[in-house]
């Protein structure tokens, strides 16, 4: 068209994909009557009539815009709905009277890309490659126009650098007219890049201005040769028997070499390979003192077959051996003395304590306990505790039972038992002594003996209550080679209404236990002593 070059620049209208573009015809009244206007789209310099206005009434022309155009603002504005990227072109309005004039509008279309998707090269990158290797790929889908990509490493933008950094970007047009951008970052990496954080950023424009979207940060597997191998022990600090100890090999290479852990045989001084779990960790559970020794790790690079050896590491599993007490089963006469000696070995300095088993009372701090002028109450348990003060929880104990020779000692001398005539009584009688006594009863019935511990016996008698029994009562006699002793059980008739807690009625029968709930006289509670005989 002659003189078109002198035409003013078109008015710019910016709109996002999917929204409505308002195309306002900027002809003044002098330039044309807006009640008689033709609208054209210009594509590749070809004009196509798309809409006509006559006497203020609009009419779409058949074609791609037929369904999306409408007249607004008393005919001065053409509304284009559902804008697509293909709508980015020049639209013009042409007035017919008084003379033909036109007004041009440049429609610009925008669409923000989706969040960038970054994929790291799963195969990783060797540090000694000759040229840049693929680090990661960034994809920005469905943007318009094509967004710009910037790659970052540790928060700093990466620039193209010959033989070091190369960014290769390409785009595809979707059927929608939107662009998908793919950018590949290639780089030569060094060992220090093993922890580097890479991400990509998409820069794009919208009618509201410039915007950007960032991908997540990724690290790329970087492969570099091992230079050093070492051992790590968990937990750190002092180890003790019973702990779970893990010995693992570590290397500064990636991938790590094939590890083997060996322990020096103290006899042959040869390194002997230990069996590790699937993760190459040597687990000592529970750790024992035999696990102490010199460990080392060998790392074998299966590609180069180069083998590296760690510095040896001394492992010390602290222990306390079984505690030995001598004499182990002391027997003493009343009035005599006894020296108990406690021994144990340890990898650390030991502290010894003697406790009375029944009360927990500390009797002595040290390995030797001296007991003088022994009374029979001194019989029973004494516990030696060997502990390592510098390692909490590392201790061993040994119980020794002191047996004091003596005739039987009854749990009670006499006791009243409430009974009913014709009930079956369950009587019990307890005695202690060394040697362990046997118990007999002065009445016929079913008796059974239970060894409570080696110095204590409990006899149970089932007997029917008869008038004769009520008159005589029941005696139990405990005897050993050193003498005998008797307990008397007095039987008292009780009315049904005055049953005491000592007797209970079950299906017409009553059982009454004559042994006390607490042995007022006895120190044989909770004893663990060797036992003498019961006659077989």
């Amino acid at each position: 068209v002659p003189g078109e070059a002198e035409q003013p620049a078109p008015e710019l209208v910016e709109v996002e994909v999917g929204s409505t573009a308002l195309l306002k015809c900027g002809l003044s009244q002098s330039q044309g009557n807006l009640s008689h206007v033709d609208w054209f789209s210009v594509h590749k310099e070809k004009r196509t009539l798309i809409f006509r206005v006559r006497q203020g009434q609009g009419q779409s022309e058949p074609g791609e815009y037929e369904q999306r155009l409408s007249l607004q603002d008393r005919g001065a504005t053409l509304a284009l709905t559902q804008v697509t990227p293909q709508d980015e072109r020049i639209f013009l309005c042409q007035g017919k009277r008084p003379r033909s004039q036109e007004y041009r509008i440049q429609l610009r279309v925008y669409k923000a890309p989706e969040e960038p998707n970054i994929q790291v090269n799963p195969l990783g990158i060797p540090v000694n490659s000759k040229e840049p290797e693929e680090v990661a790929t960034c994809v920005g889908r469905n943007g318009y126009p094509i967004p710009q990509v910037i790659w970052y490493k540790n928060g700093r933008p990466l620039k193209e650098e010959k033989n070091r950094v190369h960014i290769q970007s390409s785009q595809t047009v979707e059927s929608s007219g939107l662009y998908t951008l793919q950018s590949i970052l290639k780089a030569q990496l060094v060992k220090e890049d093993k922890d580097a954080q890479f991400y990509c950023e998409l820069n794009y424009r919208l009618p509201s201005g410039n915007h950007m979207k960032e991908s997540r940060e990724v690290t790329v597997p970087v492969f570099y040769p091992t230079e050093k191998v070492w051992l790590e022990v968990e937990p750190v600090g002092m180890l003790k028997e019973g702990d779970r100890v893990e010995i693992r090999c570590l290397a500064d290479g990636n991938p790590p070499p094939h590890f083997s852990i060996s322990k020096q045989n103290p006899s042959t001084r040869e390194a002997e390979e230990e069996t590790t779990n699937d993760n190459g960790v040597l687990v000592l559970e529970p750790a024992r003192k035999e696990h102490s020794g010199r460990y080392e790790c060998q790392g074998l690079d299966l590609d180069t077959m180069i083998s590296l050896l760690s510095e040896p590491q001394e492992l010390l599993v602290n222990y306390v051996s079984d505690v030995r007490v001598s004499p182990a089963a002391p027997e003493r006469q009343e009035g005599s003395s006894l020296t108990l000696t406690c021994e144990a070995e340890s990898s650390q300095d030991l502290e010894f304590q003697w406790l009375r088993e029944e009360t927990g009372q500390v009797l002595e701090r040290g390995p030797v306990l001296q007991l003088h002028d022994l009374k029979r109450e001194a019989g029973g348990g004494y516990r030696c505790v060997a502990s390592v003060p510098s390692i909490p929880g590392l201790n061993r104990t040994q119980l020794v039972n002191v047996a004091i020779f003596g005739p039987p000692w009854m749990a009670f001398k006499e006791r009243k038992v409430w009974v009913k005539e014709n009930m079956v009584l369950n009587l019990s009688c307890e005695a202690s002594g060394h040697p362990r006594p046997t118990i007999s009863w002065n009445v016929n019935g079913t008796a059974s003996e239970q060894d409570q511990d080696p110095q204590r016996v409990l006899s149970t008698l089932n007997v029917l209550v008869t008038p004769e029994l009520l008159e005589t009562g029941v005696e139990c006699t405990a005897s050993n080679d050193l003498g005998k002793n008797t307990s008397i059980l007095f039987l008292e008739l009780v009315n049904l209404t005055t049953l005491t807690p000592d007797s209970n009625t079950t299906t017409g029968l009553s059982t009454s236990t004559a042994s006390p709930h607490t042995r007022a006289n006895s120190t044989s509670t909770e004893r663990k002593l060797p036992e003498p005989e019961s006659r077989g």
């Epitope: 182990a328 027997e331 006469q333 039972n401 020779f405 080679d481 060797p530 036992e531 005989e533």
Partner: antibody, heavy 118, light 111 residues
Framework: QVQLVESGGGVVQPGRSLRLSCAAS????????IHWVKQAPGKGLEWVAR????????YYNEKFKGRFTISRDNSKNTLYLQMNSLRAEDTAVYYC???????????WGAGTMVTVSS | DIQMTQSPSSLSASVGDRVTITCRAS??????????MHWYQQKPGKAPKLLIY???NLESGVPARFSGSGSGTDFTLTISSLQPEDFATYYC?????????FGQGTKLEIK
């Protein structure tokens, strides 16, 4: 030192009697149990009897009850085993041995040999 | 009576060997963690000598290579490293009840 010494063994005819002695020294005789243990030639050990010298209480292996009697003389710190109606199967070494109240034998005499033969 | 069965009846071993002798009682000889089982060594023409008392306690003066273990009915005497002077006959004995009985003996001979 603690010692037990047996004596009284020898050759005896079946049906006759023999008294074995066991002299104790080096410990308080009345505070321990003294036992007799039999060992027939090439055979194992067999417990015969025990006495507590402090109270004179005795126990026997049923196998020897009635023919054998254990006794003591505290003034001499000596233990005895009276063996009556001897039989060929009584031929053995007889040991005396000491125990406490747990009945393990911590001190033994050297033994005395009894041979019953016609 | 409680029967005591020792095994083996005899065994041949060499100096330095680890040797185990077992003894089984016909009923339990243990009470409250204490076991009335004892072990003796006897050499030809000599009296028996106490080695282990109450199943696991080493008698004073007995070398530490001797050890005992077990409870209930099953017991073991172990010699960790045989010495020339250990070739002898070994007996177990219970004292759980009367009558006390011994095992039949295990004769340990030089291979």
């Amino acid at each position: 030192q603690v010692q037990l010494v047996e004596s009284g063994g020898g050759v005896v005819q079946p049906g006759r009697s023999l008294r074995l002695s066991c002299a104790a020294s080096g410990f308080t005789f009345s505070n321990y149990w003294i036992h007799w243990v039999k060992q027939a030639p090439g055979k194992g050990l067999e417990w015969v009897a025990r006495i507590y010298p402090g109270t004179d209480i005795t126990y026997y292996n049923e196998k020897f009850k009635g023919r054998f009697t254990i006794s003591r003389d505290n003034s001499k710190n000596t233990l005895y085993l009276q063996m009556n109606s001897l039989r060929a199967e009584d031929t053995a070494v007889y040991y005396c041995a000491r125990s406490g109240g747990y009945w393990y034998f911590d001190v033994w005499g050297a033994g005395t040999m009894v041979t019953v033969s016609s | 009576d409680i029967q005591m069965t020792q095994s083996p009846s005899s065994l041949s071993a060499s100096v330095g060997d680890r040797v185990t002798i077992t003894c089984r009682a016909s009923k339990s000889v243990s009470i409250s963690g204490y076991s009335y089982m004892h072990w003796y060594q006897q050499k030809p023409g000599k009296a028996p000598k106490l080695l282990i008392y109450l199943a696991s306690n080493l008698e004073s003066g007995v070398p530490a290579r001797f050890s005992g273990s077990g409870s209930g009915t099953d017991f073991t005497l172990t010699i960790s490293s045989l010495q020339p002077e250990d070739f002898a006959t070994y007996y177990c004995q219970h004292s759980r009840e009367l009558p006390y009985t011994f095992g039949q003996g295990t004769k340990l001979e030089i291979k």
